[in-house]
Interface confidence: low
Amino acid sequence: EEELQVIQPDKSVLVAAGETATLRCTATSLIPVGPIQWFRGAGPARELIYNQKEGHFPRVTTVSESTKRENMDFSISISNITPADAGTYYCVKFRKGSPDTEFKSGAGTELSVRAKPSAPVVSGPAARATPQHTVSFTCESHGFSPRDITLKWFKNGNELSDFQTNVDPVGESVSYSIHSTAKVVLTREDVHSQVICEVAHVTLQGDPLRGTANLSETIRVPPTLEVTQQPVRAENQVNVTCQVRKFYPQRLQLTWLENGNVSRTETASTVTENKDGTYNWMSWLLVNVSAHRDDVKLTCQVEHDGQPAVSKSHDLKVSAHPKEQGSNTAAENTGSNERHHHHHHHHHH
């Protein structure tokens, strides 16, 4: 009679985490007498998975009735598979003895566990940045297997190319993590923008996982200021307005100064939102010209989001007919005209 062969017909088995793996094994003969054992790995450090002769293996069930002497099917099922179960499983025939001795091993079945990646978590910089600056976003996802994974970055649906991705660990592991850092250049229109990290993996069946970050939490759009004066019906009064345009976030404090002296401070409350997500605000100052003998320098000073103040001044002529004359005291970008909500702050001298 031919010598017993241990046949493991499946070179590899692929199972999703949480499912049951079936590992097939048959012997070609009943002789010699002796139990079958299943091991994960080879060599002295191999791990016993199932022993037909003795032991308790709560996650393992035999596919066939293993107690029958004529049984030559030694297939097993392992329930609730996790990435930690990955490895090569050997079906080994033992020869009866004291103790039993190893007789012949199957060629092995590689069990690969497919575990889904965790939802990608996208995090941005700790501090806000202004347009034209480059900021970094990180994306992390964990616990997936096999190692092969694809990560893409998008900004408002447009794929980004400036990013670096690492999958750890480099060597073999039961599960893996991915970490990616993308660089994004901010624009003034990015208040409503989103950065998206998309992870595709074999376990996701073509439906990638996405993590998002809103650039509204990252961007700071500094305001542009415009100070103008309009005559009012009363000849001794001039209405001076400070238009604060295109700023984000809303946190803003405005101070009026007359000849360098603080006249009034107010905080932006009811603002107008532009289509791009930035805000506009307007403050009015009613100046009693007759109370001044000399020309008045009116300054609109704005502190936005805790940043150094920017200001714009207007020289108010009291000796002649008032004329508009503005001068910048801080560098600024010009904002486009938008609809404004008018706050009437009457200040009399």
């Epitope: 070179k11 590899s12 060629a107 092995g108 096999p146 190692r147 694809t150 991705t165 999958v167 595709a200």
Partner: antibody
């Protein structure tokens, strides 16, 4: 059908670099590895390295480490192999070949790109 | 690095013959061994992967066997189109390596 189309023959001077491209079609490019194998005239096959197209993981043969650079462009479904500091003994046919992620067999091959290094 | 030694380096056979080519690895490589056929001026073609798995579309007269360190490729009833050079390749660990090749010629 699955196909790998390689760039045309190259003639280079010693010390120069050559970049060979391999355009894949007929399968999901990111699902496989791309191997690069060369064959010096009259000799056997020699593995140079691979790139896993899905995550750009690269492994080079120690023999070519420092001289070879394998890259891929997933949007163009194309793999590239650049060999620098060319010497006359680099005259060979360079093949790209698709590989699986487990057994690393090479089941689809390009037709090969002949690179001649001569002064 | 794992070395793969192929033998013989060449052999002469006739149509209808049974031909066996052997491949030995310098260490155990389980069943991570593949076989290729190459004809002059052409790219190699995969015949067998994982020591014994016949690649789709390859005639059944080709068969592979072996595990560990010793492997063989058998061609039952050699056909005219089988005259070519055959390579084994270990895929157990990097660097992947090929045998030196066996040229099967017409007797």
């Amino acid at each position: 059908q699955v196909q790998l189309v390689q760039s045309g023959a190259e003639v280079k001077k010693p010390g120069a670099s050559v970049k060979v491209s391999c355009k894949a079609s007929g399968y999901t490019f990111t699902s496989n590895a791309m191997h690069w194998v060369r064959q010096v005239p009259g000799q056997g096959l020699e593995w140079m390295g691979w790139i896993k197209a899905g995550n750009a993981e690269i492994k080079y043969s120690q023999k070519f480490q420092g001289r070879v650079t394998i890259t891929r462009d997933t949007s163009a479904t194309t793999a590239y192999m650049e060999l620098s500091s060319l010497r006359s003994e680099d005259t060979a046919v360079y093949y790209c070949a698709r590989g699986d992620y487990y057994y690393y067999y090479m089941d689809v091959w390009g037709k090969g790109t002949t690179v001649t290094v001569s002064s | 690095d794992i070395q793969v030694t192929q033998s013989p380096s060449s052999l002469s056979a006739s149509v209808g013959d049974r031909v066996t080519i052997t491949c030995r690895a310098s260490q155990s490589i389980s069943d991570f061994l593949n076989w290729y056929q190459q004809k002059p001026g052409k790219a190699p073609k995969l015949l067998i992967h994982a020591a014994s798995s016949l690649q789709a579309g390859v005639p059944s007269r080709f068969s592979g066997s072996g595990s560990g360190t010793d492997f063989s490729l058998t061609i039952n009833s050699l056909q005219p189109e089988d005259f070519a050079t055959y390579y084994c390749q270990q895929s157990y660990s990097t660097p992947l390596s090929f045998g030196g090749g066996t040229k099967v010629e017409i007797k």
